[in-house]
Interface confidence: low
């Protein structure tokens, strides 16, 4: 679509005569008729296929034509066309005399024609005017002409439609050749694709307007380059969405099981050495002088009754000291200077001479012991406490302090780990020697049946066009990450195809 423009500049008819030679009375009131048609080697009568236009009376005999409107007519004259400009044309310009005000062809006398010119040739679309002058015996016409494209039409033939826009269908202005020039922040064939925030991850981020970076499911951060770990992940990270890769010292599906209790909690007291022995489990090796699960109890070295023969024990900073009764000596009062004559056996013990009276031995009644029957029997010496229980003398009786997981007088009973009903979602609990095991019903897994086994929503390959499928474990649904050029929840629609056919 375009316009053939004809600019009439000057008409000379010095004698004021018609084509027949007859003079106009009182002068030739001149108007023009223009016919534009397809190229003809010899311009012949027939329809003005490209259009016609007439002017009002522009002057008498000889006159110059102004560039703007003149008596209601426009100069340049406009001959619009709504087809591809063919590049060639034929042009006929007729000058007529108007005796009255009615300029219709049927209202004019047959001999009212002043002059007629016909030209043909090639003409390219462009802003530059072609100047021409046609002279006959009696008249001369000077004019110029050109072809320009209508608004929104471009190209060598005005065949390229381009209308600037800034909406859902495109964000562009038009170049002189009709090609699109995207507005800042937009790209793509039709400038519909926003240019995302610089650095926005190509696959994991997208945008609906320029300088934006929206994250696809499973990703976060300003540039959508940080994965979102599995919901509930405590001490872990991810390299792809919904992962939970445990930090050092942590285990379990959610990295919430402490495998390094020693480092994280420092449970051992008084300089004891801590050793990890499983999830939330540890063992403290106590320094001399301390006891208890966490070595929190100070141990008196006299508690083991190291002094024999009735010697009394005194605690000291660096150990203990035995105060021996008369007739005994040595670190533990173990050496005797007595004989049976000195009645050394206490608590009804009977004395027996040894080594020709140089030594003796006491035979003690039940419940007494020691080289002089001076000690009540230590009920803990036989180590009656099972499963690592600690034996404590309490007057006439003894008592076992049991390790966690054991009970009973002698710590002989294993506390049922299953008593707390630790298995979730109806799991069956089994007591083991050093812990428990859960047998999970269908659809659940994990140490305590706490994890709902996810259905792999991606197994059915729901995404089209080589899109990447992600399973959202929290909802058992899938998310399709579309490659460039496709849209839709399953990436089923192509985007930005070139038009299927020209309009």
């Amino acid at each position: 679509s375009g316009v053939f423009q004809l600019q009439l500049q000057e008409f000379i008819n010095e004698r004021g005569v018609l084509a027949s030679g007859r003079p106009c009375e009182p002068g030739c009131r001149t108007f023009f008729r223009v016919c534009l048609k397809h190229f003809q080697a010899v311009v012949s009568p027939g329809p003005c296929t490209f259009g016609t236009v007439s002017t009002p009376v522009l002057g008498t005999n000889s006159f110059a034509v102004r560039d703007d409107s003149s008596g209601g007519g426009r100069n340049p004259l406009q001959l619009p066309f709504n087809f591809t400009w063919p590049g060639t044309f034929s042009l006929i310009i007729e000058a007529w005399h108007a005796p009255g005000d009615d300029l219709r062809p049927e209202a004019l006398p047959p001999d009212a024609l002043i002059s007629k010119i016909a030209i043909q040739g090639s003409l390219a679309v462009g802003q530059n005017w072609l100047l021409d002058e046609q002279t006959s015996t009696l008249t001369r016409l000077r004019y110029s002409y050109r072809v320009i494209c209508s608004d929104n039409y471009y190209g060598d033939n005005c065949s390229r439609l381009c209308k600037k826009r800034n909406d859902h269908f495109g964000h562009y202005v038009c170049q002189p050749d009709g090609n699109l020039s995207c507005l800042p922040g937009w790209t793509g064939e039709y400038c519909q694709q926003p240019i995302c925030l610089s650095g926005c991850h190509e696959q994991n981020g997208y945008c609906s307007k320029p300088a934006e970076c929206l994250c696809r499911p499973g990703w976060q951060g300003r540039l959508c380059n940080e994965c979102i770990p599995h919901n509930g992940c405590r001490h872990g990270t991810c390299s792809t969405p919904w992962q939970c890769t445990c930090d050092e010292g942590w285990g379990g599906l959610f990295c919430d099981q402490d495998l390094n209790y020693c480092t994280h909690h420092s449970p051992c007291k008084n300089g004891a050495t801590c050793s990890n022995s499983g999830q939330r489990s540890y063992t403290c090796t106590c320094r001399p002088g301390y006891t208890g699960v966490d070595c929190e109890l100070e141990l008196s070295e006299c508690d083991s009754n190291p002094c024999r023969n009735g010697g009394s024990c005194k605690d000291q900073e660096d150990g203990y000291h035995c105060l021996c009764p008369p007739g005994y000596y040595g670190l533990h009062c173990e050496h005797s200077t007595l004989s049976c004559a000195d009645s050394p056996c206490f608590n009804g013990g009977s004395c027996r001479e040894r080594n020709q009276g140089a030594n003796y031995a006491c035979e003690c009644p039940p419940n007494f012991t020691g080289s002089n029957c001076e000690k009540k029997v230590d009920r803990c010496t036989s180590n009656p406490c099972a499963n690592g229980g600690q034996c404590l003398n309490r007057g006439p009786s003894r008592m076992c302090r049991c390790r966690p997981g054991f009970t009973g007088t002698y710590c002989e009973l294993h506390v049922s780990d299953c008593a707390r009903n630790p298995c979730a979602h109806g799991g069956t609990c089994h007591d083991l020697e050093n812990g428990l095991m859960c047998t999970c019903p269908a659809g659940f897994s994990g140490r305590r049946c706490e994890v709902r086994t996810s259905i792999d929503a991606c197994a059915s390959s729901p995404c089209f066009n080589r899109a990447t499928c992600y399973t959202d474990l929290s909802t058992d649904t899938f998310v399709c990450n579309c490659p460039y050029g496709f849209v839709g929840s399953r990436c089923e629609f192509p985007v930005g195809l070139p038009p299927s056919f020209p309009w």
């Epitope: 269908f169 299927s500 309009w503």
Partner: nanobody, 120 residues
Framework: EVQLVESGGGLVQPGGSLRLSCAAS????????LGWFRQAPGKEREWVSC????????YYADSVKGRFTISRDNVKNTVYLQMNRLKPEDTAIYYC?????????????WGQGTQVTVSS
Amino acid sequence: EVQLVESGGGLVQPGGSLRLSCAASGFTFENYALGWFRQAPGKEREWVSCISSSDGTTYYADSVKGRFTISRDNVKNTVYLQMNRLKPEDTAIYYCALSLGSSWCAYDYWGQGTQVTVSS
């Protein structure tokens, strides 16, 4: 699968009216621009009208402006073309078309078409 099914065509006298319907399925209807184009025997396919997805803006070819009206019903997933003051030169097969947004006059999917004949 994208499906576009046209109906409402037929024989009508010059100056008469017809209303074409296009039932759409297989995609999220309200998210996309839809329109109509036609093809007369021995002629090139000609764009007729289009309606955008966002604000329902309508576009018409000069040859039908003032006579044809396009509309859409996002609940019924249907697009309509009301044709008034029909002329013999409107005779053609009319196709309903779905645009995936490349341009409002470039269509990616279209239906089988419905015949409109304007004759006395």
